[in-house]
């Protein structure tokens, strides 16, 4: 058993049918010694008396808020949560496996640049009685600080007969050095509590691996005289690291007809302009990627040919 926060304790339960459970001793936080009784949740049934209460925790029915009283007065509370292990595996019931980029991906994180700021998000089908707490550091043995905000509900969507809720959190490395080579990964730890169930989820990554630039900005077309060709120009996104001479991007320019079946023309360039043939009813799209490290491409920025 360990303390999650003041008066909230997590019992780690290795569960299987007929498992003996975990013996837990609760101590009433009071100088009183006599006339103390214990109850669970809203029940008035007395579970025991004395300054300590010993319980055998076998299932969620044994978890909840234990209260010690004396003469009708509440002395202290202890909320017991369960962290359940079955077949040697800690439960992962609260969050949805996003399966991208691989199975058992519960947390996904992205950074728009090398500033040490990143966003993580996760999915759940649970709508109520749910709390999250996020901690992060660089490295684990001698951790360096990363500050995370509060997790917030960022999106709701319907998937079949299911409602899905997306939560996200923003974190910032306290002493980020954008130009330095990373040797220790960022560790992100999410504590999730649903009703009386505690679970924890972790992700480990280098900022360089989660980079996804914003799309190029100010995408413009300039027709070339007496030609079907146009000059496409764009700028680095505002959120990208500076100086651009050091934090360079490469770009992919795509001409796409109205029909998805039409052949796409693609040009790759390190410049912020390109000359392409603009077909009728086509659109021109540009996306960006770190020039020197193959992390994710940005989303497309698009303009119609007409």
């Amino acid at each position: 058993i360990w303390e999650l926060k003041k008066d909230v304790y997590v019992v780690e339960l290795d569960w299987y049918p007929d498992a003996p459970g975990e013996m837990v001793v609760l101590t009433c936080d009071t100088p009183e010694e006599d006339g103390i009784t214990w109850t669970l949740d809203q029940s008035s049934e007395v579970l025991g008396s004395g300054k300590t209460l010993t319980i055998q925790v076998k299932e969620f029915g044994d978890a909840g808020q234990y209260t010690c009283h004396k003469g009708g007065e509440v002395l202290s509370h202890s909320l017991l949560l369960l962290h359940k292990k079955e077949d040697g595996i800690w439960s992962t019931d609260i969050l949805k496996d996003q399966k991208e980029p691989k199975n058992k991906t519960f947390l996904r994180c992205e950074a728009k640049n090398y500033s040490g700021r990143f966003t993580c998000w996760w999915l759940t089908t649970i709508s109520t009685d749910l709390t999250f707490s996020v901690k992060s550091s660089r490295g684990s043995s001698d951790p360096q600080g990363v500050t995370c905000g509060a997790a917030t509900l960022s999106a709701e969507r319907v998937r079949g007969d299911n409602k899905e809720y997306e939560y996200s959190v923003e974190c910032q490395e306290d002493s980020a050095c954008p130009a330095a080579e990373e040797s220790l990964p960022i560790e992100v730890m999410v504590d999730a509590v649903h009703k009386l169930k505690y679970e924890n989820y972790t992700s480990s990554f280098f900022i360089r691996d989660i980079i996804k630039p914003d799309p190029p900005k100010n995408l413009q077309l300039k027709p070339l005289k007496n030609s079907r060709q146009v000059e496409v120009s764009w700028e680095y996104p505002d959120t990208w690291s500076t100086p651009h001479s050091y934090f360079s991007l490469t770009f992919c320019v795509q001409v796409q007809g109205k029909s998805k079946r039409e052949k796409k023309d693609r040009v790759f360039t390190d410049k912020t302009s390109a000359t392409v043939i603009c077909r009728k009813n086509a659109s021109i799209s540009v996306r960006a990627q770190d020039r020197y490290y193959s992390s994710s491409w940005s989303e497309w920025a698009s303009v119609p040919c007409s």
């Epitope: 049918p17 299932e59 029915g61 019931d93 089908t125 649970i126 007969d161 299911n162 169930k197």
Partner: nanobody, 123 residues
Framework: EVQLVESGGGVVQAGESLRLSCAAS????????MGWFRQAPGTEREFVGS????????YYADSVKGRFTISRDNAKNTVYLQMSGLKPDDTAVYYC????????????????WGQGTQVTVSS
């Protein structure tokens, strides 16, 4: 919300078998741990057994262990209670329940309940 409807109850002789079904509609059934409870006249609701989300683990009250089996078919949004070696003591209204906490024998850990189906075991 999840709506639960039990079926399959009836009158049987001691020693016989019966299979109860609980059909779920509404939000995705496979998100929920499922439990069976029963209530005889003048008594409190009693835990019978439960099954986890994936159907890979079950949990039973001592009084029914070895005689009752719970299973689920997530494709059909249905949970089953197979009862064999029935005794007169098993006479009760049987309720299906859906919740988020497995294993739990405590009724308040379940959020959604069916209306119940009567099982009568005569000697």
């Amino acid at each position: 919300e999840v709506q639960l409807v039990e079926s399959g109850g009836g009158v049987v002789q001691a020693g016989e078998s019966l299979r109860l079904s609980c059909a779920a509609s509404g939000r995705s059934f496979s998100n929920y741990e499922m439990g069976w409870f029963r209530q005889a006249p003048g008594t409190e609701r009693e835990f019978v057994g439960s099954i986890n989300l994936r159907g890979s683990s079950t949990y039973y009250a001592d009084s029914v262990k070895g005689r009752f089996t719970i299973s689920r078919d997530n494709a059909k949004n249905t949970v089953y209670l197979q009862m064999s070696g029935l005794k007169p003591d098993d006479t009760a209204v049987y309720y299906c329940a859906a919740g988020w906490l497995y294993p739990s024998s405590r009724s308040r850990d379940y959020d959604y309940w069916g209306q119940g189906t009567q099982v009568t075991v005569s000697s």
